[in-house]
């Protein structure tokens, strides 16, 4: 076509490859389908798949017989039954199975690529009965003000169509109560809010709602809990539990329907004012909307007068002809009881209270009939003197007696048996019990019970501090408030190490956090203290910039505890601490690792049998170089399993082949002097594989760090653009490239075609062939 020193014009020629369908389709996956009874679900490609080396997925046709327990339809036409579909339709999620009839069934099918047929297959369809959750019960809880009320099966009763065990019917609290709290009887209610509970716990009466008394009076208040009932595989059910807190309700724990009805203590023969601290019906007024409240009042009608004294309003005696007083008079301090003398017997009066409308008009509203107790005490009575109390400390799950160190009074004119204590409010970390008084909690006991060691505390709750609010009286003096502090210590603690401490390489230091050190017992221990019992080898622990051997959880949480490398010869370190929380200790080892300041390539698979250039697109410690003002060094610690890192000759003229490398620098990477020979996994069929390099990265003035380059490999595909620079391709590919007739399988450009940059050495296709075939 030309003389030796001449060239012809370029000639284009077309190569047409005629496909030959000579490979049969192979059914590779046929797992069958599990679905809900009566449902329609797609047949996923993961359940039914076939391959064919020389046919596309749209040419692979499944021809089916009438299914025994439903029908096959296409997504676009769910009303029309089909008898055939393609792999492409399966891949697109377009093939649906609509279940009807027996639970176990399926359909027979054959598979064809148009040329070859693979008959006699069966696709199994198993339907499961749909499990339905249902909620019965009133879903309304009536609670007495300030009291604890268990949720019951009358309130909340879940069941499932499958007869699920109540232990597996789980409620999640989506939105907790606003006027109180939900807690578990066996756990502490002062800690975190209850998030989950089971129907079994409801049946056991262990799920409790506690109403917290607000500072402002109310007559009726409404709270709601939003719950989600779940029990896989059933669908979740949302539920709302309505809580009505009302003074209307008959409350065994609270005999009065009034905001306050505490009674009065008066010295014999003397007078005492009855104030709203003792008698207060303002909760009746609270039933009136606030704009109109000032126009209403509560009328008290005395139905039985005191027998040993007299009631006076504004110094006017009340009597059968004038038996009324008002809440407003009470609030103004105008109601007085005057004792007539002649003994210290109990007194009191009975009354009816109801809402009174504007100017005395009738108004619909709450009413109550009650008694007000008046205790007359001896004028010579010396009231009991409470003594200082030492908190009771015991471990969770144990029992300890209450002694005089916790509860004692000095009372010269009362015997220990006459000094009575009443529990006003109990903590949730346990309960008081009396020896021989049954297993349950006691709410009343005497000083004699304490002195004889009969009173004990049972720590059945969580390990938190709690306080008993007590009322103490000798029966002749007004009750005095007392408190008993109980501190429950954990039986054991654990130091939780969620992650090793990662030190950024360029910094060489890092703050510890709860990820490294956190102490838990049955709850988190925020006041834990730590002592270093084995220090780090290559660094120091610092607080406020100074080395330390002791620090607190608070300092950790504030980010004040820092680990700093001082010896830059290791990429990891460790230290051991002893944690102490509320008298219990535990030790733990904190591991320290250095996080390499290295940008590692994360792209698609690399071709097996090829050599690719290791350059800053694959590994780049440039930022570390800038930060340290040095040339980072790499040491190969491990890998690759299939292949090797080599130093490549700079030019064809350079003597010798590529040499194995165990150490290299950032400069080597930037110079393009390194290659990675990607090997083929031996002893197995060709296919995708994974491999990695483990490197140690060093730089001046910082600790070394271990990093890994993980990569996927696959058999070389000349049609695929590889996003790394290829220095050579596999032998077979080179042989093919040398044949004049050859072309890439798809007619696309050959192995140098890639993105983002050409994958061959500069100089184009011929120089690539020259460099690799004839070097």
């Amino acid at each position: 076509a030309s003389e030796m020193d001449r060239q012809s014009h370029p000639v284009a020629f077309t190569v047409t490859v005629l496909p030959v369908n000579d490979q049969p389709p192979i059914l590779t996956t046929n797992t069958g389908l599990q679905m809900w009874e009566g449902a329609t679900a797609p047949i996923p490609a993961e359940a039914l798949r076939s391959t064919d080396g020389d046919s596309g997925s749209e040419d692979l046709v499944y021809t089916i017989e009438q299914p025994s327990n439903g029908r096959v339809v296409l997504r676009g036409a769910p009303g029309t039954e089909v008898r055939s579909f393609t792999q492409a339709q399966l891949d697109g999620g377009l093939v649906l199975f609509s279940h009807r009839g027996t639970l176990d069934g399926g359909f027979r099918f054959r598979l064809s690529d148009g040329e070859h047929t693979s008959p006699g297959h069966f696709f199994r369809v198993t339907a499961q009965k749909q499990v339905l959750l249902s909620l019965k019960g009133s879903q309304t809880l009536t609670v007495c003000p300030g009291s604890v009320q268990p949720l019951s099966s009358q309130t909340l009763r879940a069941s499932s169509s499958a007869g699920t065990d109540p232990q597996l019917l789980l409620y999640r609290v989506v939105r907790g109560p606003q006027l109180g709290r939900l807690f578990h009887a066996q756990q502490d209610s002062t800690g975190e809010a209850l998030v989950n509970f089971t129907q079994a716990e409801v049946y056991a009466g262990n799920i409790l709602y506690e109403h917290e008394m607000p500072p402002e009076p109310f007559w009726e208040a409404h709270d709601t809990l939003e719950l989600q009932l779940s029990s896989p595989p059933a669908r979740d059910v949302a539920a709302t539990l309505a809580v009505a807190v009302s003074f209307e309700a008959a409350c065994p724990q609270r005999p009065s329907h009034l905001w306050k009805n505490k009674g009065l203590w008066v010295p014999e023969g003397q007078r005492a004012r009855i104030t709203v601290a003792a008698l207060d019906a303002s909760n009746l007024l609270a039933s009136v909307p606030s704009p109109q409240r000032s126009e209403h009042d509560v009328l008290f009608q005395v139905t039985q007068f005191p027998s040993r004294g007299q009631l006076l309003v504004s110094e006017e005696p009340l009597h059968a002809g004038q038996p009324h007083f008002l809440q407003s008079q009470l609030a103004a301090g105008q109601l007085v009881y005057a004792h007539g003398g002649g003994g210290t017997q109990q007194d009191g009066f009975h009354f009816r209270a109801h809402l009174q409308g504007p100017a005395g008009a009738s108004v619909a509203g709450p009413q109550t009939s009650e008694a007000f107790a008046i205790t007359v005490r001896d004028v010579n009575e010396r009231p009991p003197q409470p003594q200082a109390s030492v908190p009771l400390r015991l471990t969770r799950g144990s029992r300890a007696p209450i002694s005089r160190a916790q509860l004692s009074v000095v009372d010269p004119d009362s015997a220990p048996g006459e000094i009575e204590y009443e529990v006003q409010r109990a903590p949730h970390n346990g309960f008081l019990s009396l020896v021989g008084g049954g297993l349950g909690p006691v709410t009343r006991f005497t000083q004699a019970d304490v002195d004889s060691g009969r009173l004990a505390f049972v720590a059945n709750g969580s390990s938190v501090a709690g306080i008993f609010q007590l009322s103490m009286s000798d029966g002749a003096s007004p009750p005095l408030p007392m408190s008993l502090a109980v501190d429950i210590l954990p039986s054991a603690i654990e130091v939780q190490l969620r992650a090793p401490l990662e030190v950024p390489q360029a910094l060489g230091r890092s703050s510890l956090s709860q990820q490294q050190l956190r102490v838990v017992s049955d709850r988190e221990e925020p006041e834990a203290a730590y002592r270093l019992i084995q220090g780090p080898q290559y660094g120091h622990l610092l607080v406020g910039g100074r080395p330390t051997s002791a620090f607190s959880q608070f300092q950790i949480d504030q980010g004040e505890v820092v680990f700093a490398f001082t010896n830059f010869s290791s990429s990891h370190d460790h230290f051991r601490v002893l944690a102490l929380a509320r008298g219990v200790n535990a030790s733990a080892v904190v591991n320290v690792t250095v996080r390499a300041l290295l940008h590692v390539w994360a792209g698609g698979p690399w071709p097996q049998g090829a050599t690719l250039r290791l350059d800053p697109t694959v590994l780049d410690a440039g930022e570390l170089a800038n930060r340290t003002g040095s040339v980072p060094r790499f040491r190969l610690l491990e890998g690759p399993r299939h292949g090797r890192v080599v130093r490549v000759p700079r030019a064809r003229t350079e003597p010798g082949g590529s040499q194995l490398v165990e150490q290299f620098t950032q400069q080597d990477l930037e110079d393009g002097r390194l290659g990675l020979e990607v090997g083929r996994p031996e002893g197995r069929a060709p296919g995708p594989a994974g491999d990695s390099l483990t490197l140690e990265l060093w730089a001046q003035g910082v600790p070394p760090a271990v990093a890994s380059l993980d990569f996927a490999t696959e058999p070389y595909n000349a049609a695929r653009p590889y996003s790394v620079a290829l220095l050579s391709v596999p032998e077979a590919a080179r042989t093919e490239a040398g044949k004049p007739e050859s072309s890439t399988p798809t007619g696309e450009p050959g192995p140098m075609a890639s993105s983002p940059e050409p994958a061959v050495a500069k100089g184009g296709f011929l120089s690539f062939l020259e460099a690799n075939m004839f070097s």
Partner: antibody, heavy 117, light 113 residues
């Protein structure tokens, strides 16, 4: 025992405003009572005009509402009635009364007001 | 508003005899909040202010002689003077305190026969 005493002009011209005061003695006007005005035309029955609480809340007879105003002065322990645009039909004995619970418990002696030009 | 009617307009009774006055309200004055009838009876002698006799339909005010008694519920009420005395000559008014406006009956004049 609380005593009430009405005072004010005995003669008022038509279209003018009738003003009466009730002084409370023997007890505080700030106590838990409502204070009312009731009138009785000569030879006729009783008619409630309105009621006030010491804090200023008032209730009026709707038939007179546009004309009647009751006010309280706790510092002077008294309350007052103003009736505007009077006519001869407003001639009556005007009583102040203490409303206790749901009844008029104590009454003043009453004062006759004649509307005449 | 609640309208109160009384009957008779007047009655004359011999000394020592029983006098009965009726009062009717246009709607019930029985309160649901305390089960009381908000109905009061007053006595007015010539030249004097009215005086409370009975409240809540049947409760005698302190200091009122026990010959005066009240009864009834809902809409129908009665004031009875069991043995008329000379000092009982007066006009008797019933009054509802159930709702605003508070209203009085027209009055019943009691004389000695």
């Amino acid at each position: 025992e609380v005593q009430l005493q009405e005072s004010g002009p005995g003669l008022v011209k038509p279209s003018e405003t009738l003003s009466l005061t009730c002084v409370v003695s023997g007890g505080s006007i700030s106590s838990s009572n409502w204070w009312s005005w009731v009138r009785q035309p000569p030879g006729k029955g009783l008619e409630w005009l309105g009621t006030i609480y010491y804090n200023g809340n008032t209730y009026y007879n709707p038939s007179l509402k546009s004309r009647v105003t009751i006010s309280v002065d706790t510092s002077k322990n008294q309350f007052s009635l103003r009736l505007s645009s009077v006519t001869a039909a407003d001639t009556a004995v005007y009583y102040c009364a203490k409303s206790w619970v749901s009844w008029f418990a104590s009454w003043g002696q009453g004062t006759l007001v004649t509307v005449s030009s | 508003e609640l309208v109160m009617t009384q009957s008779p307009d007047s009655l004359a009774v011999s000394l020592g005899e029983r006098a009965t006055i009726n009062c009717k309200s246009s709607q019930s004055v029985l309160s649901s909040s305390n089960n009381k009838n908000y109905l009061n009876w007053y006595q007015q002698k010539p030249g004097q202010p009215p005086k409370l006799l009975i409240y809540w339909a049947s409760t005698r005010e302190s200091g009122v002689p026990d010959r005066f008694s009240g009864s009834g519920s809902g809409t129908d009420f009665t004031l009875t003077i069991s043995s008329l005395q000379a000092e009982d000559v007066a006009v008797y008014y019933c009054q509802q305190h159930y709702s605003v406006p508070f209203t009085f009956g027209p009055g019943t004049k009691v004389d000695i026969k």
